[in-house]
Amino acid sequence: VPPGEDSKDVAAPHRQPLTSSERIDKQIRYILDGISALRKETCNKSNMCESSKEALAENNLNLPKMAEKDGCFQSGFNEETCLVKIITGLLEFEVYLEYLQNRFESSEEQARAVQMSTKVLIQFLQKKAKNLDAITTPDPTTNASLLTKLQAQNQWLQDMTTHLILRSFKEFLQSSLRALRQM
């Protein structure tokens, strides 16, 4: 069920329409639900979730991560800088979410839902941001070659990459959710 269309909202007609912040909050929680389902399949299928060899694969990936300089942490919190980081990070994750498509058997629709919901989340956040010029969009050519490279990996590395993308994306969304609720 897409965010904003659950039975709770239908059963409460007196409820005010969702604010922009509430819509974003709900959207992130919806994506986190999807990631949770995908992680279940990944962890059931292989022992990647317990593996200590993550560092080997992590070197090949440049997954977005929150750092103190991004303005999303309480010390040095900066709403606009943080918002730019969140949007930029989500745009950078898009190529990795594309990679996740066709990586799941029983959760194929869920993988697509995570990808599409992330696009919607980016749109919501872009409406909220004042300084859209500061947002750098990843280069399509670079993304295409990265995708080819990732898809050419052996099976073990592909499984590990899938696990790392899901874990990192979850962490990035949680950091974003925390920061957005402080805004």
């Epitope: 942490f73 949680q174 925390r178």
Partner: antibody
Framework: QVTLKESGPTLVKPTQTLTLTCSFS??????????VGWVRQPPGKALEWLAF???????YYSPSLESRLTITKDTSKNQVVLTMTNMDPVDTATYYC??????????????WGQGTLVT | DIQMTQSPSSLSAFVGDGVTMTCWAS??????LNWYHQRPGEAPELLVF???NLQIGVPSRFRGSGSETYFTLTINSLQPEDSGTYFC?????????FGGGTKLEI
């Protein structure tokens, strides 16, 4: 099984610094979505949130006490330390550490230590 | 800061009765509201998170509801062990704040 335990002095003189340690087991403070907070309760009064530290070292403090508080973590030792400077008799309370751990960051404390009474 | 107000401050009831206590937030907190139970001399215990989700192991006699600024905790078929103080806490953003508590006497 998740457990937390507070340790530190039971008696502190005015103007001194209080250092409390929260030792925990059954979870890792390097897992995303996990955090540890400190809450105190003066005798017969309500709960008061003091400080919080997240898996990624993001830290939050109660605005009224921020200048006196410092929270740190040692992930390898499974410990969180709270220091409170310039102690005063009004700071007499039971000090609790508690864990927050859920995917959606509801900031709910699902497991608490037994508490330590500081006078 | 978001202020949390609980009502009533105390109430008494008999075993088997049902009671409802309320918690108000000074601004909308969506569904980021948690309820705790504390017995004298013990640490608080999480009962309900995210306004209506029962924590694992909590009996179904407990029910949380509400959203935005108004929340309730209902306890049906009261048991002797339900006595103590109930606190609400918002989990919307930092700083976190607790309500003043509702003391329940059975």
């Amino acid at each position: 099984q998740v457990t937390l335990k507070e340790s530190g002095p039971t008696l502190v003189k005015p103007t001194q610094t209080l250092t409390l340690t929260c030792s925990f087991s059954g979870f890792s403070l390097s897992t995303s979505g996990v955090g540890v907070g400190w809450v105190r309760q003066p005798p017969g009064k309500a709960l008061e949130w003091l400080a919080f530290i997240w898996w990624d070292d993001d830290k939050y403090y109660s605005p009224s006490l921020e200048s006196r508080l410092t929270i740190t973590k040692d992930t390898s030792k499974n410990q969180v330390v709270l220091t409170m400077t310039n102690m005063d008799p009004v700071d007499t309370a039971t000090y609790y550490c508690a864990r927050s751990a859920d995917d959606y960051l509801y900031y709910s404390f699902d497991t608490w230590g037994q508490g330590t009474l500081v006078t | 800061d978001i202020q949390m107000t609980q009502s009533p401050s105390s109430l008494s009831a008999f075993v088997g009765d049902g009671v409802t206590m309320t918690c108000w937030a000074s601004q909308s907190i969506n569904d980021y509201l948690n309820w705790y139970h504390q017995r004298p001399g013990e640490a608080p215990e999480l009962l309900v998170f995210a306004a209506s989700n029962l924590q694992i192991g909590v009996p179904s006699r407990f029910r949380g509801s509400g959203s935005e600024t108004y929340f309730t905790l209902t306890i049906n078929s009261l048991q002797p062990e339900d006595s103590g103080t109930y606190f609400c806490q918002h989990g919307h953003s930092f700083p976190l704040t607790f309500g003043g508590g509702t003391k329940l006497e059975i």
